[in-house]
């Protein structure tokens, strides 16, 4: 946020640039949380803008029993590697079909034991303020899904009628990884010292991080005709003086009017 | 990149005996899979059968077994299917598939490299 000045007093200006604001030589460009000619605002409203979509990803091992391992399958540049990754992705692609998160799978690792398939699943969801849910419920229908398959898809005197076969027993879900995303703990620390008065409020689904001197929200404070003033002891409303009314009060709701005042002291001289 | 040819196919009374051939090129190693499938007109592709060429596996589907071997010569890169006692049932487009995979499996989407086919007729 910047405020360009023009004229002499701008060397003045230079050395009171506030709250670690500085002086390019025409005005004072403000940290993010700061606006005003001199940096001396605190601002109403952080962007804490959400990635549009949350990853989460999980590791599985399966065994496959229809492939008989070779030593080149633990080389990934190898044809046999890569030949075996064309066919377990397309079999992967099949089994998780139904799961709208669904992004494909990576293969970290094949071992011996027919051949053992460490990977990852990875499944992606657009960002809501249900993101967790929605990943845990995706999550859950893959291994269903894959526990199914594992179970179905088996080998029948020594033999494979299906893309692949599994062991039904060599189905493990090692670990789940979700992208962390917590826009209250965003909006805390990029408010900073300021942390206890911003909060977080959706609206379309879109958390913004505001204080209560940002107008349209509910937490929003109503200064009336003042100005909402945010300092290190919360919100304050600054009233004004019209060329007819005094304004007072916490929300600037009080109006005393000039002339009642001054007809009062005139009646005193 | 695996390049498979067929020939040898023809028409045969039944009875008769045919021998078909897959030549192979475009390959890195020499433990892969080969295998003989069929389709007759208006079914699916089916498995006639499957070798490995380490030596280590072969299968053949119930209906021919008994009349047809599958072998191979691994310094010709060459895959034969050598098809005796010829029945109508018999007649399909057979193609010669590969991996370069051991697979175990019958199922013709697990077999990435194919053939473009040759016609087997049995009829009198």
């Known amino acids: 946020r910047t405020t360009t000045c023009f004229g002499d007093g701008c060397q003045n200006t230079a050395s009171r640039c506030k709250n670690g604001g500085t002086w390019d030589g025409l005005k004072c460009q403000c940290p993010n949380l700061y606006y005003g000619e001199l940096c001396e605002e605190v601002v109403s409203s952080i962007d804490i803008g959400p990635p549009e979509t949350i990853s989460a990803q999980m590791e599985l091992t399966v065994t496959v029993t229809s492939v008989k391992f070779t030593e080149e399958l633990k080389n990934h540049s190898s044809q046999e590697f890569q030949e075996f990754k064309q066919t377990f992705t397309e079999q992967m692609n099949i089994v998780y079909s139904g799961i709208p998160e669904y992004v494909g799978v990576n293969i970290t690792k094949l071992r011996l034991g027919s051949v053992v398939v460490e990977h990852d699943v990875l499944l992606r969801t657009k960002y809501t303020p249900e993101y967790k849910t929605v990943l845990d419920n995706a999550t859950e229908v893959v291994k269903e899904k894959i526990t199914k398959v594992t179970t179905q898809q088996i080998m029948i005197n020594d033999i494979c009628s299906d893309m692949m076969c599994f062991n039904t027993t060599g189905t493990q879900v090692q670990n789940i990884t979700v992208t962390q995303y917590d826009p209250e703990e965003d909006c805390r620390k990029m408010a900073k010292e300021y942390g206890d008065y911003f909060v977080v409020e959706y609206r379309d689904q879109k958390p913004y991080c505001i204080s209560p001197c940002e107008p349209g929200f509910s937490v929003s404070k109503n200064c009336n005709l003042g100005k909402c003033q945010m300092s290190l002891s919360g919100p304050q409303c600054l009233c004004v003086t019209t060329e007819t009314h005094w304004y007072s009060g916490e929300t600037c709701n009080q109006g005393t009017q000039k002339s009642l005042v001054y007809g009062h002291h005139h009646h005193h001289h | 990149e695996v390049q498979l040819v067929e020939s040898g196919g023809g028409v045969v009374q039944p009875g008769g005996s045919l021998r078909l051939s897959c030549a192979a090129s475009?390959?890195?190693?020499?433990?892969?899979?080969m295998a003989w499938f069929r389709q007759a007109p208006g079914k699916e592709r089916e498995v006639v059968a499957f070798?490995?060429?380490?030596?280590?596996?072969?299968y053949y589907a119930d209906s021919v077994k008994g009349r047809f071997t599958i072998s191979r010569d691994n310094s010709k890169n060459t895959l034969y299917l050598q098809m005796n006692s010829l029945r109508a049932e018999d007649t399909a487009v057979y193609y010669c598939?590969?991996?370069?995979?051991?697979?175990?499996?019958?199922?013709?989407?697990?077999?990435?490299?194919w053939g473009q086919g040759t016609m087997v007729t049995v009829s009198s």
């Open positions: 598939a590969a991996s370069s995979l051991l697979l175990q499996t019958i199922n013709p989407r697990a077999w990435p490299y």
């Open positions: 070798i490995w060429t380490d030596g280590g596996r072969t």
């Open positions: 475009g390959y890195t190693s020499n433990r892969y899979s």
